[in-house]
């Protein structure tokens, strides 16, 4: 189908000739307190990368899904054939019925005992989650601090290997930068040593301490 | 036409065990039930396995089941009967033979020239 | 088991004879029966099905009939080539079920 916005639409428009603000506009910034440090990430890139993750994580769902669709698909195609009833006549036939009838008794004995399993589990899944809660009120939960999460760290949980390739290289890029700035912290400690000890202050600063 | 051959027969001792085969052509195999009927020295026709178009289900009287098998395979259109514990009253003549239906009523339609299987010690 | 019994083992009648053999069945079968020819050389055919339809290819001098538990086939007009062994059978329940045969011989 084709679209109907012209092209001009949506070609960028030019940006308006900057408006001259009177100095009183400007004073108000400087008394403002300052910002607080800005993040490395602008709101509109934290919105689409949460957009991107939600994406991702309604295709795993759907996925997941499809699976389970699958997955059912072939148990019911395994346990239930086909029925061929070409040259079968009324005699095979009424037979046929007393091997399905045996087969759904078969099938009810185990549905009976698979209920009978899960009934117990819940039954214990119940009483383990009340000891739980009783433990619980014997200790002081302690206040849980709100961690930011970072991107990466995001995606990482999200994608899980898929990720990894992409996240290591960006994560080895920050590890050098992180090398060379503990680097450069060491050379300039060792520099201010050198000066202390030239004009005699590593001394006076012991018999200071002292 | 439709025609069935078997082979597969021969002689053995009790105990024993036996594949028997037998070739269709002229029909689309794949579309009918078939069956073997066997007869005996004395001359009595006995049914003793059916088996449906896609192999899903078989039929055996009690005096085979557990020891025959029947079975297909619609890519060669050949039907096959395992026969294993083989014993001296299975001696008999085994035709291979077509199964229709009208309303509900069951028959075999074409017959093979059959294939002997003798059991003796 | 359903049993199945034919009054007489062995025929005789002459060319051009009207023979009819008979059939019974040690319960209902409700019309589920058939009817096969064996020749001397051991082919086996099928003649009639569900008590009274002929098979294709088959001559029209046979005919059956019959209902509940009692049944027969009808050869009109006796040919050479009819010389043969005929056996019932029912369809009615499971196993398949066939008489001994009656054996058809020329006066």
């Known amino acids: 189908m084709a679209d109907g916005s012209s092209d001009a639409a949506r070609e960028p428009r030019p940006a308006p000739a900057p408006i001259r603000r009177r100095s009183s506009n400007y004073r108000a910034y400087a008394t403002e307190p300052h910002a607080k440090k800005k993040s490395k990430i602008s709101a509109s890139r934290k919105l689409q990368l949460k957009t991107l993750l939600l994406q991702i994580a309604k295709q795993e769902l759907e996925r997941e899904a499809e699976e389970r669709r699958g997955e059912k698909g072939r148990a019911l195609s395994t346990r239930c054939q086909p029925l061929e009833l070409a040259g079968l006549g009324f005699a095979e036939l009424q037979d046929l019925c007393r091997q399905l009838h045996a087969r759904v008794d078969k099938v009810d004995e185990e549905r009976y005992d698979i209920e009978a399993k899960v009934t117990k589990n819940i039954t214990e899944i119940a009483d383990l989650t009340q000891k739980i809660f009783d433990l619980r009120g014997k200790f002081k939960r302690p206040t849980l601090r709100r961690v930011r999460i970072s991107a990466d760290a995001m995606m990482q949980a999200l994608l899980g290997a898929r990720a990894k390739e992409s996240l290591d290289l960006r994560a080895h890029l920050k590890q050098v930068k992180k090398e060379d700035t503990e680097k450069e912290n060491r050379e300039v400690g060792d520099w201010r040593k050198n000066i202390d000890a030239l004009s005699g202050m590593e001394g006076r600063k012991k018999k200071f301490e002292s | 036409e439709v025609q069935m051959v078997e082979s597969g027969g021969g002689l053995l001792k009790p105990g024993g065990s036996l594949k028997l085969s037998c070739a269709a052509s002229g029909f689309t195999y794949s579309n009918y039930a078939m069956s073997w009927v066997r007869q005996t020295p004395e001359k009595r026709l006995e049914w003793v396995a059916t088996i449906s178009s896609g192999g899903s289900y078989s039929y055996y009287p009690d005096s085979v089941k557990g020891r025959f098998t029947i079975s297909r395979d619609n890519a060669k259109n050949t039907l096959y009967l395992q026969m294993l514990s083989l014993r001296s009253e299975d001696t008999a003549m085994y035709y291979c033979?077509?199964?229709?239906?009208?309303?509900?009523?069951?028959?075999?339609?074409?017959w093979g020239q059959g294939s002997s299987v003798t059991v003796s010690s | 088991d359903i049993q199945m019994t034919q009054t007489s083992s062995s025929l005789s009648a002459s060319l051009g004879d009207r023979v009819t053999i008979s059939c019974r069945a040690s319960?209902?079968?409700?019309?589920?029966l058939n009817w096969y020819q064996q020749k001397p050389d051991g082919t086996i055919k099928l003649l009639i099905y569900y008590t009274s339809r002929i098979h294709s290819g088959v001559s029209s001098r046979f005919s059956g009939s019959g209902s509940g538990t009692d049944y027969s086939l009808t050869i009109s007009n006796l040919e050479q080539e009819d010389i043969a062994t005929y056996f019932c059978q029912q369809g009615n329940t499971l196993p398949l079920t066939f008489d001994t045969g009656t054996k058809l011989e020329l006066k």
């Open positions: 033979a077509r199964r229709d239906n009208y309303y509900g009523s069951t028959f075999m339609d074409y």
């Open positions: 319960q209902e079968i409700t019309n589920y």
